[in-house]
């Protein structure tokens, strides 16, 4: 993820981003790019915009992509069927 600044809520981030938990410091949230094709994801990550504070360190997939299971516990952003 590209660090583009600390945040608290999605509304503080630019387009194509969400305010996700830092993978380095769990107490910090940073504006993080939404999932691109092939990126890891979680199907229950809150959609954008979310008005609370996220717990996941990944953002939802970009529009047109879906978070799909590829194996028992692995999900990646793939083109929507």
């Amino acid at each position: 993820a590209v660090i583009t600044g600390a945040c608290d809520k999605d509304s503080q981030c630019g387009g194509g981003m969400c305010c996700a938990v830092s993978i380095w410091v769990k107490s910090i949230r940073i504006c993080t790019p939404m999932g691109k094709l092939g990126d890891s994801c979680h199907p229950l990550t809150r959609k954008v915009p979310f008005f609370g504070r996220r717990m996941h360190h990944t953002c939802p997939c970009l529009p047109g992509l879906a978070c799909l299971r590829t194996s028992f516990n692995r999900f990646i952003c793939l083109a929507q069927k």
Epitope: H42, L44, T45, R46, K47, F51, G52, R53, R54, M55
Partner: antibody, heavy 121, light 111 residues
């Protein structure tokens, strides 16, 4: 004070449809999702799904797809659940519950009082 | 679907003592270092009330005698010291996988 006021008890015929309402007050309606939960007599709780009160996006428990339909009316801060093709298995108390916005914990922090649905033949 | 099994089904606890309720999940409900398990209390004729979210976080306004712990597949709700008003049915709920599922409930009676 956050309040969720649900519509009154319903007694309907097998095969009919019913629409339950959940009027929200005391908070910014569009900032929170609304869940719907089923509780059959003397049984546990069953999650039906939820709707974004911001943009109307829905997520349904696969078991209730085609059975339940969620909608929201932002102007009246009311969420609705329509249940169709009713059978005796649908007789239960149905709750709306606000999502608490605790990240991906999807915790339901305020609940309506419940709407009793009885399906009779 | 993730199956949650609560035990015991019911228990009677003396006033001031500890009530311990277990919830076992059929698979892990952890992700990224967090445990996605909630606990609710329900009294007869009332809707459920949120007690604990994300395994161990006490909901605002809930007395500190309620606490939650656990990770992976094994979770516990503790009530200590138990008070008269704690007589209720308690449910665990997992929110790590769609569909979200609830345990079958544990009924707590006060002796």
């Amino acid at each position: 004070e956050v309040q969720l006021q649900q519509s009154g008890p319903e007694v309907v015929k097998t095969g009919a449809s019913v629409k339950i309402s959940c009027k929200a007050s005391g908070y910014s309606f569009t900032d929170y999702d609304m869940h719907w939960v089923k509780q059959s007599q003397g049984k546990s709780l069953e999650w039906i799904g939820y709707i974004s009160c911001y943009n109307g996006a829905t997520t349904y428990n696969q078991k209730f797809k085609g059975k339940a339909t969620f909608t929201v009316d932002k102007s009246s801060t009311t969420a609705y659940m329509q249940f169709n093709s009713l059978t005796s298995e649908d007789s239960a108390v149905y709750y709306c519950a606000r999502d608490g916005n605790y990240g991906e914990a999807y915790a339901m922090d305020y609940w309506g009082q419940g709407t009793s649905l009885t399906v009779s033949s | 679907d993730i199956v949650l099994t609560q035990s015991p089904a019911s228990l009677a606890v003396s006033l001031g003592q500890r009530a311990t309720i277990s919830c076992k999940a059929s698979q892990s409900v952890d992700y990224d270092g967090d445990s996605y398990m909630n606990w609710y209390q329900q009294k007869p004729g009332q809707p459920p009330k949120l007690l604990i979210y994300a395994a161990s976080n006490l909901e605002s306004g809930i007395p500190a005698r309620f606490s939650g712990s656990g990770s992976g597949t094994d979770f516990t709700l503790n009530i200590h010291p138990v008070e008269e008003e704690d007589a209720a049915t308690y449910y665990c709920q997992q929110i790590n996988e769609d569909p979200f599922t609830f345990g079958q409930g544990t009924k707590v009676e006060i002796k």
